[in-house]
């Protein structure tokens, strides 16, 4: 998930040279930007979140807000400061005319301004509930640990906290920030106001139909009786949680955001800050049958984003729409006809559908995992959720063709045992945003802060690409893929792993002069090869076929085309061992795969040769997939032969550590 490329509108209002009487001018050359929701009906013009630069203190935020008011007043405009943010993001929420945006963007400390917009509950039916008794024998599901050490925050509608399913499990906080209901004839019926939140609280921690039956919850009201809220209200809710966490630190926290709005830079930024403060955020992917990257908080990389599947593990259809999909989704979970507490009466149950329900399942699973292992980091939790998911059970034909490769084929499941996964080397695949079609376009895939980038590959549907390379950015390795002339764009694919005490570096060999191809190996003592990448400047790599098999005794070697530079990812970590596994097919084939065996984890996936008919390579779970152009276009020459190269690793150190614990 990337939060830098959502299809949202960015209006950069250039700073005028005269400073309009400001005491402090913004730093030279910086231009604050204005953002608004790309979905016009969801915009809320007249209310703006002014986000200040990261190190801005509360007193400076208040001073900047007052300055805006004073300068607006001099121009004859009334403004109202609705809230001053601190704790998560510095800034303030202001009600003002859009005419003042240019003025506001020139204020000192301003980083960007975002127009407020709507967010919505992600369940259907919202009001067509049917009362149903629970459909299963409750005693079939008795989890070993019900999440009792974890607190789950729910940002949703009001809830009926004394419903028999959740009574005593949910503490209703005094937080409320909701917009007025639409329509003059709207009748505020209590049971409808509570419907969405009550159901989700039941799915997370309900006595009889809940996932984490021991989890305690706290509810914040950010959605009104129509299931509608605002980005600003959600931000203030997230800030409330952060302040509560600081005032009274408790055990692990899970925040459930069963809502979605258009792409929002500020909402994603707030989620990132909260996640970096050690909070696990789980959100609905959205019910728009669309790319989840176009919605927030679903597009925030630090958030665990959940799509919805049904009892047959198929993507959920919701009327004419359905679950969102794409690279910003982490995994799917049950989200159709989910039984839970109904606010219609204190003992009623109802079925609801949507990505909200799916997210509630994952929040419950997360609570149970964290209760069993309270020290888990967000990265460790996400990797475990992925690891224990059911793989390759979703019918991908439901997704648009261009999204199938990007969408994870994973359905959340409870681990068979909440303990004992510590020995595993966990890895996941992270796809970048699409680079776009320009000649020099690149795409970047990043791992989470406490994950290691162990390999980097690229993929282009047209096959026109110039490979990929690992490079340092801000003290961390990233994976960058390069588009080629005439290409429709590329994706970078990072293999992100949990490898404690790892020391990784990239060794590069420039294009070889000799016809034998380019080679590079890990020459440092104790370093093992975890991934190979190749990058070339020429537009077309021709048909040169390097030797595929490595010389004996050279397992730590990457081999590539003589016109390409080759990059080896070399890592040293306690007990880390890796091996190269290849699968070559002499005849042309659209897809070649090679998988790591049980107990080994795929860290690297690449293709040999790197010629232009190879579309690219990527990891799907523990399998390396190499895709080539349609067989009919390549003919059956030897040029069509492709080898998939997997690097499989395991950590003896992790295995020993877990045995010592048991």
């Amino acid at each position: 998930q990337e939060d830098e490329d959502g299809d949202y509108e960015e209006l950069v209002l250039a700073l005028r040279s005269e400073e309009d009487g400001l005491a402090e001018a913004p730093e030279h050359g910086t231009t604050a930007t204005f953002h608004r929701c790309a979905k016009d009906p969801w915009r809320l013009p007249g209310t703006y979140v002014v986000v200040l630069k990261e190190e801005t203190h509360l007193s400076q935020s208040e001073r900047t807000a007052r300055r805006l008011q004073a300068q607006a007043a001099r121009r004859g405009y009334l403004t109202k400061i609705l809230h001053v943010f601190h704790g998560l993001l510095p800034g303030f929420l202001v009600k003002m005319s859009g005419d003042l945006l240019e003025l506001a963007l020139k204020l000192p400390h301003v980083d960007y301004i975002e127009e407020d917009s709507s967010v919505f509950a992600q369940s259907i039916p919202w009001n067509l509930e049917r009362i149903t008794p629970p459909r299963y024998r409750a005693d079939e599901y008795q989890p070993p640990d019900g999440g009792s050490l974890v607190e789950v925050y729910l940002l949703d509608t009001s809830i009926q906290s004394d419903h028999r399913e959740i009574e005593g499990r949910v503490m209703v906080t005094d937080f409320e920030n909701v917009p007025e209901e639409d329509g003059t004839r709207f009748h505020r019926q209590a049971s409808k106001c509570d419907s969405h939140g009550t159901h989700l609280a039941g799915v997370v921690s309900g006595r009889d139909a809940g996932v984490a039956k021991g989890a305690s919850m706290r509810s914040l009201r950010v959605l009104n009786c129509q299931g509608k809220g605002t980005v600003s209200g959600t931000l203030i809710g997230l800030e409330f949680i952060r302040k509560s966490q600081l005032v009274q630190p408790v055990g692990p926290l899970v925040v459930l955001l069963p809502l979605a709005g258009g792409y929002s830079r500020v909402l994603n930024a707030a989620c990132q800050r909260l996640a970096r403060a050690g909070v696990v955020l789980v959100t609905a992917a959205g019910n728009f049958r669309d790319d989840a990257c176009l919605y927030s908080p679903a597009s925030a990389p630090e958030v665990i984003t959940v799509g919805a599947t049904n009892a047959q593990d198929q993507p959920v259809t919701l009327g004419t729409l359905g679950t969102n999909f794409g690279r910003c989704v982490d995994l799917f979970a049950p989200g159709e006809d989910i039984i839970g507490a109904s606010s219609d009466c204190s003992t009623c149950f109802v079925s609801q559908s949507g990505t909200s329900q799916a997210a509630a399942h994952v929040a419950g699973i997360a609570a149970m995992m964290l209760s069993a292992e309270p020290e888990l980091t967000l990265a460790e939790l996400r990797q475990r959720l992925i690891h224990f998911s059911a793989k390759d059970v979703i019918n991908e034909a439901w997704f648009p063709e261009d999204q199938r490769v990007l969408t994870p084929n994973l359905v959340a499941a409870l681990p068979p045992s909440t303990h004992g996964a510590g020995w595993q080397l966990f890895c996941r695949t992270v796809w970048s945003a699409h680079s776009g079609p320009t000649r020099m376009a690149t795409a970047v895939a990043r791992c989470a802060p406490d994950e290691e980038l162990l390999s980097c590959s690229s993929f282009s549907r047209s096959g026109k690409r110039r490979g990929e390379r690992m490079e340092a950015q801000g003290g961390k390795l990233v994976c960058r893929a390069h588009n080629a002339f005439g290409g429709e764009g590329v994706y970078a694919i990072a293999r992100c792993c949990l490898l404690p005490q790892a020391n990784c570096s990239v060794h590069t060999a420039p294009p070889a002069e000799a016809s034998m191809g380019t080679r590079v190996h890990c020459h440092q003592q104790g370093h093992v090869l975890t991934g190979c990448s190749s990058h070339w400047e020429v537009e077309d790599l021709g048909t040169h076929k390097p030797p595929v098999l490595r010389p004996r005794g050279q397992p730590n070697q990457c081999v590539g085309h003589r016109e390409a530079s080759i990059h080896a990812s070399c890592c040293h970590a306690p007990g880390l061992e890796c091996k190269v596994k290849e699968h070559g097919i002499p005849a042309p084939q659209e897809q070649v795969t090679v998988a790591c065996e049980e107990g080994w984890t795929l860290t690297g996936c690449s293709a040999l040769p790197g010629t232009s008919h190879v579309l690219g390579a990527y990891a799907v779970d523990n399998t390396c997939v190499v895709r080539s152009r349609d067989v009919s276009t390549t003919g059956s020459t030897s040029e069509g032969a492709v080898t998939a190269v997997a690097i499989c690793c395991r950590s003896r150190h992790l295995a020993q550590a877990s045995q010592e614990l048991q």
Epitope: P133, P134, R137, A138, D139, Q142, Q160, S161, D162, R164, E167, G168, V170, M171, V172, A190, R207, D208, K213, C345, S346, T347
Partner: antibody
Framework: QVQLVQSGAEVKKPGASVKVSCKAS????????ISWVRQAPGQGLEWMGW????????NYAQKFQGRVTMTTDTSTSTAYMELRSLRSDDTAVYYC????????WGQGTTVTVSS | QSALTQPASVSGSPGQSITISCTGT?????????VSWYQQHPGKAPKRMIY???NRPSGVSNRFSGSKSGNTASLTISGLQAEDEADYYC?????????FGGGTKLTVL
């Protein structure tokens, strides 16, 4: 600490009504409903019904439907149970308990119905 | 709603273990996790000893444990002590209400 304190003993004539109160303290009153349970002399416990402190909704046992009214007053964190058309077999100790979970009980109110 | 079925009385000597059963149907005990057990001493209000089949509230001795199989729940008291002599009631959710067992008188010999 969490406490439920009930009103004192009552003696009523057949056909009359009785209203028992139950004052809650030590917790967020609207987070739980209040259950009412009675126990006739030498008999077991009998669940009468439940009232929501959140929205006033009620759930009565079929046996008492039409004869019982359960209410709450959030301003004083107090729940009330009124039983009408009393008969001699309504003589019992009436308990309030916190929620359906019934994790905390009042001390009980003895209601004697006698002519 | 008819009451859940409990034995009218059980007895045991100090230090022994006893088990009290509570039999319902697939619409109450069998359908829900919410089986509770209450202890009542003469002239006192009931006290919750076990909730949600097998959970013990804080302050309740670990000599008390609960379990469930199908439509029958059980309360086991190990290492019987004189102060355990009391009436014991089980309760369960039904689809719309709550139901109690008829009660079991435990005598410590």
């Amino acid at each position: 600490q969490v406490q439920l304190v009930q009103s004192g003993a009552e003696v009523k004539k057949p056909g009359a009504s009785v209203k028992v109160s139950c004052k809650a303290s030590g917790y967020s009153f609207t987070s739980y409903g209040i259950s009412w349970v009675r126990q006739a002399p030498g008999q077991g416990l009998e669940w009468m019904g439940w009232v929501s402190a959140y929205n006033g909704n009620t759930n009565y046992a079929q046996k008492f439907q039409g004869r019982v009214t359960m209410t709450t007053d959030t301003s004083t964190s107090t729940a009330y149970m009124e039983l009408r058309s009393l008969r001699s077999d309504d003589t019992a100790v009436y308990y309030c308990a916190r929620g359906y979970v019934m994790d905390v009980w009042g001390q009980g109110t003895t209601v004697t119905v006698s002519s | 709603q008819s009451a859940l079925t409990q034995p009218a009385s059980v007895s045991g000597s100090p230090g022994q273990s006893i088990t009290i059963s509570c039999t319902g149907t697939s619409s109450d005990v069998g359908a829900y996790n919410s089986v509770s057990w209450y202890q009542q001493h003469p002239g006192k209000a009931p006290k919750r000893m076990i909730y949600e089949v097998s959970n013990r509230p804080s302050g309740v001795s670990n000599r008390f444990s609960g379990s469930k199989s199908g439509n029958t729940a059980s309360l086991t008291i190990s290492g019987l002590q004189a102060e355990d002599e009391a009436d014991y009631y089980c309760s369960s959710y039904t689809s719309t209400n709550m139901v109690f067992g008829g009660g079991t008188k435990l005598t410590v010999l």
